[in-house]
């Protein structure tokens, strides 16, 4: 797991300050109010979003 400020979490994950580790964005379905879910919502859901402005 990556520490904040060094490298981003792997694809499909987001940093949780509460838990001090990268967490799976998939878990936001069950726990949408988790702190890291904001980072998941901001991330592009599919690769093609990275290719087109």
């Amino acid at each position: 797991e990556q520490a904040p400020g060094t490298a981003p979490c792997s694809r499909g994950s987001s940093w949780s300050a509460d838990l001090d580790k990268c967490m799976d964005c998939a878990s936001c379905r069950a726990r949408p109010h988790s702190d890291f879910c904001l980072g998941c919502a901001a991330a592009p859901p599919a690769p093609f979003r990275l290719l087109w402005p």
């Epitope: 838990l19 799976d24 964005c25 998939a26 878990s27 379905r29 069950a30 859901p45």
Partner: antibody
Framework: EVKLGESGGGLVQPGGSMKLSCVAS????????MNWVRQSPEKGLEWVAE??????????HYAESAKGRFTISRDDSRSSVYLQMNNLRAEDTAIYYC??????????WGQGTSVTVSS | DIVLTQSPASLAVSLGQRATISCKAS??????????MQWYQQRPGQSPKLLIK???KLDSGVPARFSGSGSGTDFTLNIHPVEEEDTATYYC?????????FGGGTRLEIK
């Protein structure tokens, strides 16, 4: 290092009661839902009960086989979860494991405590 | 309840070869983005251990010879190349809804 220590198992007669305990360490207990899962040769792995967080008003959920007979509870100050089992039946004979889950995955498992219901 | 059917019930694979285990769900456990299926390993005399989460994501510390795939109702666990220490029973588990259910398990023996 995550540690989960189940205790309280043993031999009990049909219709009897038993309370299982699980003490946890090595992860932020108050942020994790806690589960009891049991395993028997007859039924394999079977989820039994789950308790959520203080912010969820300690919501509980049960397998159909546990409803009305089993009660899950937790003590965040002791990083412990409990399973009160009443009106035990022969089919409740199993190894009982506690396991934390943040949302979907049972991330860690203890060594389990064995429950035998027999006359 | 969602029923998970694993196959085969047991298999024997030669050291270094590929082991493939199937798990079929009685209804879809996937959204358009994620699949809510996990795989666990239980070595003889030990407790279950999480291997793969969300169908294909390896848990921390799990060797890369393990891989998971699938979506909807059909999921697969692959182990390649198998090693002696992979002798175990493997279980799938869904987290789509309550109650969580497990497959019946697949016992892997290394020849």
């Amino acid at each position: 290092e995550v540690k989960l220590g189940e205790s309280g198992g043993g031999l009990v007669q049909p219709g009897g009661s038993m309370k299982l305990s699980c003490v946890a360490s090595g992860f932020p207990f108050t942020k994790y839902w806690m589960n009891w899962v049991r395993q028997s040769p007859e039924k394999g792995l079977e989820w039994v009960a789950e308790i959520r967080l203080k912010s969820d008003n300690y919501a509980t959920h049960y397998a159909e086989s546990a409803k009305g007979r089993f009660t899950i509870s937790r003590d965040d100050s002791r990083s412990s979860v409990y399973l009160q089992m009443n009106n035990l039946r022969a089919e409740d004979t199993a190894i009982y494991y506690c396991s934390p889950t943040y949302a979907d995955t049972m991330d860690y498992w203890g060594q389990g405590t064995s429950v035998t219901v027999s006359s | 309840d969602i029923v998970l059917t694993q196959s085969p019930a047991s298999l024997a694979v030669s050291l270094g070869q590929r082991a493939t285990i199937s798990c079929k769900a009685s209804q879809s456990v996937s959204t358009s983005t994620y699949s809510y299926m996990q795989w666990y390993q239980q070595r003889p005399g030990q407790s279950p251990k999480l291997l793969i989460k969300y169908a294909s994501k390896l848990d921390s510390g799990v060797p890369a010879r393990f891989s998971g795939s699938g979506s909807g109702t059909d999921f697969t666990l692959n182990i390649h190349p198998v090693e002696e220490e992979d002798t175990a029973t493997y279980y799938c588990q869904h987290s789509w809804e309550l109650p969580y259910t497990f497959g019946g398990g697949t016992r892997l023996e290394i020849k």
